[in-house]
Interface confidence: low
């Protein structure tokens, strides 16, 4: 039954759609952005515990003008999924729970078999989402590749396909800065560098405060980070512009430690304003 | 390496005014002092070792009055730009760093109350 007049079941199972996506809510998923090649997804690892894999399988005649040629019932229709070590199967979701396939994984959750129907009827279409845990993704993971293979005991040649994603470790760092005051005035008399003894002789004081916030994991696992400040100390002809007196880093060193920045400021070793001591 | 400052190009020659006598405000212009084009920068670099939630860099500086009196008397306003960024040296090729730089402008003017002495 369901195998046409020739009584030979020639199915036409097709993976119509397969793409990585992120979960917006129970029933809403959003495709990940694609790389320039249009085939590889971009996955920015910044705290999402899971990634979704959207799959649409159809069993339709390949040529609508010759529907009898194929698209017959696909008996014991299955989707076999092989996951990389960095991903583990965690469950399956469907927008319509009626069409949700039964998916079972091995002990290590690296292989998944999804039952699509016995048979998957002629004209059927099913869309579902595999939920994959990203807990195995490390900072060395650069690519995710999931292998997909449709299978049936009906007559049909089936080839595996791969879904790929490039993994980026997105450092959730943000930086902001403020100067106090934001308006400065110059006045007084011209005085040579060699005559300067104290910072108070130079000109008006300005303080810059640069804050780096880290919303993610502690950074010591990701190599060494530097906070840099480009300080305009001279104008084009080599005369002093902003003279750096003091540089101090608070935080970023572990509990209670102050940071050391280089080079050292106050290279003329001017006397520090007593109010700043 | 991520977020590195761009290579410094040779600074554009900015003609100092040298004229310190008053100029009518209509003739005065606005100027920006920014590295690498119109100023030279020294980069203060602070390693962030065990970086958990936040780090704050404090830098205290002073305007060098004499330079402003000698060079920029004929300027209406000067915008002095300080830039800051985060860089990460890592063997990891796929690190992505967004919003890793900031610009902090300060406006500098001749003190309207100033009596200029050469």
């Amino acid at each position: 039954q369901g195998c046409g007049q020739d009584k030979i079941c020639q199915s036409n199972l097709q993976l119509e759609r397969y793409q990585f996506c992120s979960r917006i809510s129970d029933t809403e998923f959003q495709a990940l952005p694609m790389d320039l090649d249009g085939r590889t997804a971009l996955f920015a690892l910044s705290g999402q515990p899971f990634i979704g894999l959207e799959l649409t399988v159809t069993n339709l005649p390949s040529d609508p003008s010759r529907p009898q040629a194929d698209g017959d019932d696909a008996h014991e229709a299955q989707l076999l999924v092989t996951l990389p070590a960095s991903l583990r199967y965690s469950g399956v979701r469907a927008l319509d729970s009626v069409e949700k396939p039964l998916c079972l994984s091995n002990d290590s959750a690296s292989h998944v078999e999804c039952e699509l129907g016995n048979p998957m009827k002629r004209g059927a279409q099913v869309t579902f989402y595999l939920i994959l845990s990203t807990s195995g993704i490390t900072i060395e993971t650069t690519e995710l590749e999931v292998k997909l293979l449709l299978a049936t005991i009906s007559e049909q040649e089936l080839d595996p396909v791969s879904v790929r994603a490039h993994v980026f470790i997105e450092l959730p760092l943000s930086i902001s800065g403020v100067a106090t005051p934001q308006q400065l005035f110059f006045s007084g008399e011209v005085k040579g560098e060699s005559a300067m003894r104290s910072e108070r002789e130079l000109g008006r004081k300005v303080k810059y405060e640069v804050t780096v916030s880290n919303q993610g994991q502690s950074l010591n696992t990701l190599g060494s980070a530097n906070l840099n400040i480009m300080w305009p100390h001279e104008i084009a002809n080599g005369k002093w512009l902003l003279y750096p007196m003091r540089v101090e880093l608070e935080g970023g060193q572990g509990p209670g430690k102050r940071g050391i920045c280089s080079p050292r400021p106050n290279i003329l070793q001017l006397d520090v304003d007593s109010r700043d001591r | 390496e991520l977020g590195q400052p761009e290579p410094q190009e040779p600074p554009e020659k900015v003609e100092p005014s040298t004229s310190w006598w008053p100029v009518s405000s209509a003739e005065k212009r606005n100027m920006t002092l920014d590295c690498p084009r119109t100023a030279k920068c020294v980069v203060f670099s602070c390693p962030l070792y065990s970086f958990d939630r936040a780090a704050v860099l404090h830098v205290w500086g002073r305007l060098w009055n004499s330079t402003f009196l000698e060079e920029y008397m004929a300027v209406k306003s000067l915008e002095v730009i300080v830039r800051a960024n985060i860089t990460v040296k890592s063997s990891i090729k796929n690190l992505l760093l967004r919003d890793a730089s900031t610009v902090i402008p300060v406006m500098v003017y001749l003190d309207p109350m100033a009596v200029v002495v050469e």
Partner: antibody, heavy 117, light 106 residues
């Protein structure tokens, strides 16, 4: 480590609206949903609603007309607001993180709310 | 909305013994059921999700099974720390808790 902490007024009058804040740490509200659950004295747990990572909200249909859930991602805070609280609303109110898969994997310790005029 | 009927509402068992709690859903919930342990003054603790998957750190004395509308949860080798109220939660469509089962030790 992952933590959620509820804070509220403790006592609220029927004429006022009930507002509770859930402050989270150890994870980002842009990656996880947060649910609200309550337990009246001597009774079982009742699901109130959820705000998903993307800001979408779903509510218990019996309470939908009186409930609103919102959040401030930058402050890591989720807010529950209930209009016209009655004595039936006296309960321990909990916030819980959505374990992505749909369960609630981490809970706050709860905050007690009493309604009295 | 999906209703969850949990039974029994309370039960008493001996140390070292085994107890089983059941939850029946008003419709097929596709194995989307979790089980929680709740002790006074604390937030509930997730023990099992997706019918039978143990949370990390939860002893294998706890187990779950079921499909369709019928689900069960068991604790074997009871110890004093197991005294608590246990709840099932369906999360196939929105969320609904069962009425709870208060476990006491004889």
């Amino acid at each position: 480590q992952v933590q959620l902490k509820e804070s509220g007024p403790g006592l609220v009058a029927p004429s006022q609206s009930l507002s509770i804040t859930c402050t989270v740490s150890g994870f980002s509200l842009t990656s996880y949903g947060v649910h609200w659950v309550r337990q009246p004295p001597g009774k079982g747990l009742e699901w109130l609603g959820v705000i998903w990572a993307g800001g979408i909200t779903h509510y218990n249909s019996a309470l939908m007309s009186r409930l609103s859930i919102s959040k401030d991602n930058s402050k890591s805070q989720v807010f529950l607001k209930m209009n016209s609280p009655q004595t039936d609303d006296i309960a321990m109110y909990y916030c819980a993180r959505d374990g992505y898969y749909g369960d609630f994997d981490v809970w706050g310790a709860g905050t007690t709310v009493t309604v009295s005029s | 909305d999906i209703q969850m009927t949990q039974s029994p509402s309370s039960l008493s068992a001996s140390l070292g013994g085994k107890v089983t709690i059941t939850c029946k859903a008003s419709q097929d919930i596709n194995k989307y059921i979790a089980w929680y342990q709740h002790k006074p003054g604390k937030g509930p603790r997730l023990l099992i999700h997706y019918t039978s998957t143990l949370q990390p750190g939860i002893p294998s004395r706890f187990s779950g099974s079921g499909s369709g509308r019928d689900y069960s949860f068991s604790i074997s080798n009871l110890v004093p720390e197991d005294i608590a109220t246990y709840y099932c939660l369906q999360y196939d469509n929105l969320r609904t808790f069962g009425g709870g089962t208060k476990l006491e030790i004889k």
